[in-house]
Interface confidence: low
C-alpha cells in the first residue's frame, strides 16, 4: 500500500541502491519514487551533519522485506517511496530554496529580475534541469540578478552548498509547464544519431518514449524493433541527447523507430507507467515470486500490489496451469526494464502499474510521525 | 480572496470552479476535487439552486476568462448536502458533488488528500486559501485563481470574535488579527489547505465570515476532519471501495 509518513530524526540502515544530493526530503522522496528499485529513503539536511560531503545527502534504499532498521540520527528525515500512491506520483517539484546553491554544469547565464523569472527560463530551456539565482543582495555586485541554468549527468545537483542571497530550484517541465512544446510524432524506419545516455529493453517504441520522457537526460530516442537484423539489438531502446537539444542527423533505417521526449509538452505528460499487456511475449528478469492466478489482468494486479514487482509474465503453458489458474511470474531488474524479451511464447507480459497516477489507491495514508 | 496573489498553473490542481448557467454563466463557488468523480464544497452554494442541470464544474483551470463555450466541463450526477445542514444556521456547511463522468488526473487536475478522522493533534503552520472570489468586500469575481497564506486561529479565539454565532468544534477559523487577508464572496466551498510533512491536506471548506478580511473577524471554515465518516459513507460505491482520496 501507500505510505506517506515521514520519520524525523531517523535514518534507515543499509539497503543503499543510489545516492545523490537533493535540497529537501520531499525531492529525495520523489527521486526514490521514480527509481526502479527504491522503496525507502533517508535524507540528511545541512543541519543534521558536519561532514560537508554528506550534507543534503539523499540515500535511496531497497529491501527484500520492504523495511529496514531505523537508527536515531538527529535532524535526519526518512520515509517511503510513493510507488503505489496514485495521484501523489509526480515528478513536478515547484519549491524554491532560499540560501541554497545547487551546483551543476552552468551552461547559460543571464540577468533576470526575479527567481520566478529564472525558474521560467529554466523551464523553457530544453537542457535545463535546475537553476540558481543570485538575488539583489548577493555579496558580489557583478553576480546580482544572475540566473544560472544548469544540468548534471543524473539530473540532480552535483553538490549543494549553503550560500546567502542565492535561491535555487528545479525546472518545471515535469509540471507540464514548458513553453517549448513537444513533438508527438513517431518516425518509422528512422534512426537518430548523437550521444546515447542509456540503453534499455522495451517491447515497443511507446514504452521507450515514456522511459525517455522520465529520464533526466533523454531528449530523443531510437528503438530497434523485434525484427531488427541484429538479434542482440532487437527491442533495444536507446535514450539520446545532444548539445543542441535536437538530433544532429537521422538515418533512414528499416525496423527502427525514433521520436522525442515528451517532457516539454504543454499541459499534459504521459503517465510514468505502461499499462499495455503484450500477448505472446516473455519478459525476462530476476524472479521475485511465482503465483497461480486466474487471467493476465489479475497477474498484472498482483504485480502492481507487490511493490518490488516491476514487470510480469503470465504463462499459458499446460504445465504452468491448474484448472483455470496459471502461473504468474513476478519479476524485477536493476533498471526496471526486462533483461530479455522473447517472442512466440504461450503467455503474455506487461508492467506493474505502481507508478500510474490514476489509481484510486488510498494514497493519503498518514500515521503519526515518530519523533 | 483578499490580500492574495495570482496562482500559477497546476499549483492547486484540486481547485474547481462551480458555475451556474442560467441566462448568463457565472462563477458562484469553489470546490475541491477529492476523487475521480467527487468534489467537496459548501452546502450553502446550493441554497436556492440545487437543481444539478444548471451547474457546470470546471477543473484544471487557472483563468476564468479562458473559459469559452468549447471549454470542457463536468456536470453533476448527484448533490449530497449534509443531512443536518440548515440554511438558517452556519453548521454542517458541507456538500458532496458526484460528477456524471470520472475525471482523469493530470498535473493540473488531481485530488487533494483528506485529513484523518477527527484530526486534532496535527499543528498546521502552513495554510492557504484559494479561489476566484472577490478581492474586497464590494468587489468582483477575479479572473486568475488567487491564493493567500493565512494562519489558523483557535476556536476559543474565534468564538470571542463572533459572539453572536456558535463556533463549533466542527468549524475551523483562519485569519490575521489585523485582517487584510481572507476569503471572500465567491470563494465559498473552496479549499483551505495546509502542508504538513510535505503533503497538502484539505483542512477546511470556505464557509462564512463577517465581511471580508476585517480586523479581528477571521474566516470560518467547515472542518473536514470532523466529517470524514460522513464523506466516506457517502462516497462508498456499491463495491465498497472509497472513490476518493482518504486516509486508510
Amino acid at each position: 500500500g501507500c505510505l506517506t509518513q515521514l520519520y524525523e530524526n531517523a535514518f534507515f540502515r543499509g539497503g543503499d541502491v543510489a545516492s545523490m544530493y537533493t535540497p529537501n526530503a520531499q525531492y529525495c522522496q520523489m527521486r526514490c519514487t521514480f527509481h526502479p528499485r527504491c522503496l525507502l529513503f533517508s535524507f540528511l539536511p545541512a543541519s543534521s551533519i558536519n561532514d560537508m560531503e554528506k550534507r543534503f545527502g539523499c540515500f535511496l534504499k531497497d529491501s527484500v522485506t520492504g523495511t529496514l532498521p531505523k537508527v536515531h540520527r538527529t535532524g535526519a528525515v526518512s520515509g517511503h517511496s510513493l510507488k503505489q500512491c496514485g495521484h501523489q506520483i509526480s515528478a513536478c517539484h515547484r519549491d524554491i530554496y532560499k540560501g541554497v546553491d545547487m551546483r551543476g554544469v552552468n551552461f547559460n547565464v543571464s540577468k533576470v529580475s526575479s527567481v520566478e523569472e529564472c525558474q521560467k527560463r529554466c523551464t523553457s530551456n530544453i537542457r535545463c534541469q535546475f537553476f540558481s539565482y543570485a538575488t539583489q543582495t548577493f555579496h558580489k555586485a557583478e553576480y546580482r540578478n544572475n540566473c544560472l541554468l544548469k544540468y548534471s549527468p543524473g539530473g540532480t545537483p552535483t553538490a549543494i552548498k549553503v550560500l546567502s542571497n542565492v535561491e535555487s530550484g528545479f525546472s518545471l517541465k515535469p509540471c507540464a509547464l514548458s513553453e517549448i512544446g513537444c513533438h508527438m510524432n513517431i518516425f518509422q524506419h528512422l534512426a537518430f544519431s548523437d550521444v546515447d545516455v542509456a540503453r534499455v529493453l522495451t517491447p515497443d517504441a511507446f514504452v521507450c518514449r515514456t522511459i525517455c520522457t522520465y529520464h533526466p537526460n533523454c531528449l530523443f530516442f531510437t528503438f530497434y524493433t523485434n525484427v531488427w537484423k541484429i538479434e542482440s539489438q532487437r527491442n533495444v531502446c536507446l535514450l539520446k541527447t545532444s548539445e543542441s537539444g535536437t538530433p544532429s542527423s537521422s538515418t533512414p533505417q528499416e525496423n527502427t523507430i525514433s521520436g522525442y521526449s515528451l517532457l516539454t509538452c504543454k499541459r499534459t505528460l504521459p503517465e510514468p507507467c505502461h499499462s499495455k499487456i503484450y500477448p505472446g511475449v516473455d519478459f525476462g528478469g530476476e524472479e521475485l515470486n511465482v503465483t497461480f492466478v486466474k487471467g493476465v489482468n489479475v497477474c498484472q494486479e498482483t504485480c502492481t500490489k507487490m511493490i518490488r514487482c516491476q514487470f510480469f509474465t503470465y504463462s499459458l503453458l499446460p504445465e504452468d496451469c491448474k484448472e483455470e489458474k496459471c502461473k504468474c511470474f513476478l519479476r524485477l531488474s536493476m533498471d526496471g526494464s526486462p533483461t530479455r524479451i522473447a517472442y512466440g511464447t504461450q503467455g503474455s507480459s506487461g508492467y506493474s502499474l505502481r507508478l500510474c497516477n490514476t489509481g484510486d489507491n488510498s494514497v493519503c495514508t498518514t500515521k503519526t510521525s515518530t519523533r | 480572496i483578499v490580500g492574495g496573489t495570482n496562482s500559477s498553473w497546476g499549483e492547486w490542481p484540486w481547485q474547481v470552479s462551480l458555475q451556474v448557467k442560467l441566462t448568463a454563466q457565472r462563477h458562484l463557488c469553489g470546490g475541491s476535487l477529492i476523487g475521480h468523480q467527487w468534489v467537496l464544497t459548501a452546502a450553502h452554494c446550493f441554497d436556492g439552486l440545487p437543481l444539478q442541470d444548471v451547474w457546470r464544474i470546471y477543473s484544471g483551470i487557472l483563468n476564468l476568462s479562458d473559459i469559452t463555450k468549447d471549454t470542457p466541463f463536468s456536470q453533476i450526477k448527484e448533490i449530497i448536502i449534509h443531512q443536518n445542514y440548515k440554511v438558517s444556521e452556519g453548521n454542517h456547511d458541507i456538500a458532496l458533488i458526484k460528477l456524471q463522468a470520472p475525471l482523469n488526473y493530470t498535473e493540473f487536475q488531481k485530488p487533494i488528500c483528506l485529513p484523518s478522522k477527527g484530526d486534532t493533534s496535527t499543528i498546521y503552520t502552513n495554510c492557504w486559501v484559494t479561489g476566484w472570489g472577490f478581492s474586497k468586500e464590494k468587489g468582483e469575481i477575479q479572473n486568475i485563481l488567487q491564493k493567500v497564506n493565512i494562519p489558523l486561529v483557535t476556536n476559543e479565539e474565534c468564538q470571542k470574535r463572533y459572539q453572536d454565532y456558535k463556533i463549533t468544534q466542527r468549524m475551523v477559523c483562519a485569519g490575521y488579527k489585523e485582517g487584510g487577508k481572507d476569503a471572500c464572496k465567491g470563494d465559498s466551498g473552496g479549499p483551505l489547505v495546509c502542508k504538513h510533512n510535505g503533503m497538502w491536506r484539505l483542512v477546511g471548506i470556505t464557509s462564512w465570515g463577517e465581511g471580508c478580511a476585517r480586523r479581528e473577524q477571521p474566516g470560518v471554515y467547515t472542518k473536514v476532519a470532523e466529517y470524514m465518516d460522513w464523506i466516506l459513507e457517502k462516497t462508498q460505491s456499491s463495491d465498497g471501495k472509497a472513490q476518493m482520496q482518504s486516509p486508510a
Epitope: - | T23, A24, H44, D47, S88, G90, E140, Y165, G209
Partner: antibody
C-alpha cells in the same frame, strides 16, 4: 430590528413604467439573495425575480422576462425592480423578501416586507 | 418550469381538528420545499423549509413531510390562530408557489 420596506407602487397606465424600491435595515444586506414576489388581488403568490448577493446573477419568471429588471445597490442597502411595458395582469401587491447566503443561512424566503400595491389600468 | 399543485383549494375545519394539505410538484424537487402561512392583508410567514424543518418560533403542531414530488403539511390540532391561507413553494429551480389552500372555520 430586521426590516424590509417597499415603496414606489401606484397607478400606472398599460405600457407605462414604474420603479419599485425596497430599503433593508437590521441585517447585512450584501449577504443575501433578494427576491420580488407578487400577489394579484384575491390570487396566490407568484415569484417574480431574484438577485444574488453580489448582483452578478439575476433570474426572472417567464411572465416578466424582458420587461422587468432587478438590481441592487449594496452600499445603499436597497433592492430595485424596474418595471417596463406594464400590463393589466401585472396589477398586484409586490413584496420584497430575502434569503441569506452569508451567516446564518436559510433555504426559503426568510423575511418579507409588507408590500407595495401596483395598479395597471387605463 | 416546475408547477406546484396544492389540494384542496379550500378546507373547512374546526378548532382541534387534524388538518392535512397536500402539494404535488410536476417533477422531482428532492426536499426543496417550503410552506408559508398568510393572513389577509399581511405578508406570508415561513413555517417549514426543506420539506420538514420547522422554522424557529413556529408551533410544533405544524409539521411537514415528503420528498420528490409529494409533500404534505399537517396541523395536528387546529387552533383559532391557524385559520389562514397556506402556500407551498419549491426552490429546486428558481421559485414557484402552489395556488394556495384556504383553511376556514366550518
Amino acid at each position: 430590528e430586521v426590516q424590509l420596506l417597499e415603496s414606489g407602487g401606484g397607478l400606472v397606465q398599460p405600457g407605462g413604467s414604474l420603479r419599485l424600491s425596497c430599503a433593508a435595515s437590521g441585517f447585512t444586506f450584501s449577504h443575501y439573495i433578494m427576491m420580488w414576489v407578487r400577489q394579484a388581488p384575491g390570487k396566490g403568490l407568484e415569484w417574480v425575480s431574484g438577485i444574488y448577493s453580489s448582483g452578478g446573477i439575476t433570474v426572472y419568471a417567464d411572465s416578466v422576462k424582458g420587461r422587468f429588471t432587478i438590481s441592487r445597490d449594496n452600499s445603499k442597502n436597497t433592492l430595485y425592480l424596474q418595471m417596463n411595458s406594464l400590463r393589466a395582469e401585472d396589477t398586484a401587491v409586490y413584496y420584497c423578501a430575502y434569503r441569506r447566503t452569508g451567516i446564518p443561512r436559510r433555504d426559503a424566503f426568510e423575511i418579507w416586507g409588507q408590500g407595495t400595491m401596483v395598479t395597471v389600468s387605463s | 418550469d416546475i408547477q406546484m399543485t396544492q389540494s384542496p383549494s379550500t378546507l373547512s375545519a374546526s378548532v382541534g381538528d387534524r388538518v392535512t394539505i397536500t402539494c404535488r410538484a410536476s417533477q422531482s424537487i428532492s426536499s426543496w420545499l417550503a410552506w408559508y402561512q398568510q393572513k389577509p392583508g399581511k405578508a406570508p410567514n415561513l413555517l417549514i423549509y426543506k420539506a420538514s424543518t420547522l422554522e424557529s418560533g413556529v408551533p410544533s403542531r405544524f409539521s411537514g413531510s415528503g420528498s420528490g414530488t409529494e409533500f404534505t403539511l399537517t396541523i395536528s390540532s387546529l387552533q383559532p390562530d391557524d385559520f389562514a391561507t397556506y402556500y407551498c413553494q419549491q426552490y429546486n429551480t428558481y421559485w414557484t408557489f402552489g395556488q394556495g389552500t384556504k383553511v376556514e372555520i366550518k
